[in-house]
């Protein structure tokens, strides 16, 4: 998959931009909005019908190194009882996310981008049953 | 990838950080994931929490077209398919990278930033906070 | 393809145990789970035991909890489920069915049926 250009009828490529060797791109990893922060509800991972643990994944030869994956606790929903109902189903929700590969060859490094699909959390829903003879 | 090469004394004097710039392929690994949800699952409809999706489009950006979630309603849907109110869809939030373009309009220069969007909905018990 | 077959089915008395299997031929489980549900005449359909394959969590139908065991033996690529305690309304054709994905399962073949006798 590439990044696609820019599209024409939008705009012209400036002057001011930087020059790039060919089949490749500048990327600055100074990340904008770094220190924004997310203001879910607290503990929703524990008060959902469909409750989740985290797991931190780390790689040193990734950026950023850390990423949260979810995973859901049950196969099915806790119901009104604090039971688990198998009536219903827990299924977890995903993202893409990108992030940047560091690839060693020999005594030379190499930079990839990557997308990710991360696991996010859970949610709650009606099975489906197909009827395959 | 861009190959770099490496300080002199390799491997012991390897930098652990990365650096604050880098040249990569304009190819992307892992590019068979399906970035439409809707296409890739019918949870949205499904879920005792559901959810609509909301297009944003940034040609700026990339990935240029990201998928917003908004939950349906303020409860949850019970067994019976009525809006329960005893329990709250709440938008479940994550932060991801996506590359801006730096300077703008440039096609093959980029910054990352990190942004928050909302991927969907669960259903939780409500936090209710006794006032006296 | 794969294709699930159920066995174990009978007629026991009110007490009684049975046990059910569900083999994959043509292939293997799916990878996510496996379950078990029953239909019984003019009943709506109800799953009794799930297993997911990646942690062998399990869990049941408050009606069955604490009377059906759901396992699986790898390597013979089977998923049992043993019934004890066995009562009148736990009559039904019994299917056995495997989650390609999360929240998402297949069956196939015509079930088993149970019938307890009080």
């Known amino acids: 998959r590439k990044i696609p250009k820019v599209g024409h009828t939008f705009f012209q490529k400036p002057e001011s931009c930087p020059p790039v060797p060919g089949g490749s791109m500048k990327l600055d990893i100074g990340i904008i909005n770094e220190n924004q922060r997310v203001s879910m509800s607290r503990n929703i991972e524990s008060r959902s019908t469909s409750p989740w643990n985290y797991t931190v994944t780390w790689d040193p030869n990734r950026y950023p190194s850390e990423v949260v994956q979810a995973q859901c606790r049950n196969l099915g929903c806790i119901n009104a009882q604090g039971k688990e109902d198998i009536s219903m189903n827990s299924v977890p929700i995903q993202q893409e996310t990108l992030v940047v590969r560091r690839k060693h060859q020999g005594c030379s490094v190499s930079f990839q981008l990557e997308k990710v699909l991360v696991t996010v959390g859970c949610t709650c829903v009606t099975p489906v049953i197909h009827h395959v003879q | 990838g861009i190959t770099i090469p490496r300080n002199p004394g390799c491997p012991n004097s390897e930098d652990k950080n990365f650096p604050r710039t880098v040249m990569v392929n304009l190819n992307i690994h892992n590019r068979n994931t399906n970035t439409n949800p809707k296409r890739s699952s019918d949870y949205y409809n499904r879920s005792t929490s559901p959810w609509n999706l909301h297009r944003n489009e940034d040609p700026e950006r990339y990935p240029s077209v990201i998928w917003e979630a908004k939950c349906r309603h303020l409860g949850c849907i019970n067994a019976d398919g009525n809006v329960d109110y005893h329990m709250n869809s709440v938008p479940i939030q994550q932060e991801i990278l996506v590359l801006r373009r730096e300077p703008p309009h440039c096609p093959n220069s980029f910054r990352l930033e990190k942004i928050l969007v909302s991927v969907g909905c669960t259903c939780v018990t409500p936090i209710v906070h006794h006032v006296a | 393809e794969v294709q699930l077959v159920e066995s174990g089915g009978g007629l026991v008395q009110a007490g009684g145990s049975l046990r059910l299997s569900c083999g994959a031929s043509?292939?293997?489980?799916?990878?996510?789970?496996t379950g078990w549900f029953r239909q019984a005449p003019g009943k709506e359909r109800e799953f009794v035991a799930v297993?997911?394959?990646?942690?062998?969590?399990?869990a049941y139908a408050d009606s069955v909890e604490g009377r059906f065991t759901i396992s699986r033996d790898g390597a013979k690529n089977t998923v049992y489920l043993q019934m004890s305690s066995l009562k009148p309304e736990d009559t039904a054709i019994y299917y056995c069915?495997?989650?390609?994905?999360?929240?998402?399962?297949?069956?196939w073949g015509q079930g088993t049926q149970v019938t307890v006798s009080s």
């Open positions: 069915t495997t989650g390609t994905r999360p929240g998402e399962w297949h069956y």
């Open positions: 043509g292939g293997t489980f799916s990878s996510y789970a």
């Open positions: 297993l997911r394959w990646s942690d062998s969590h399990t």
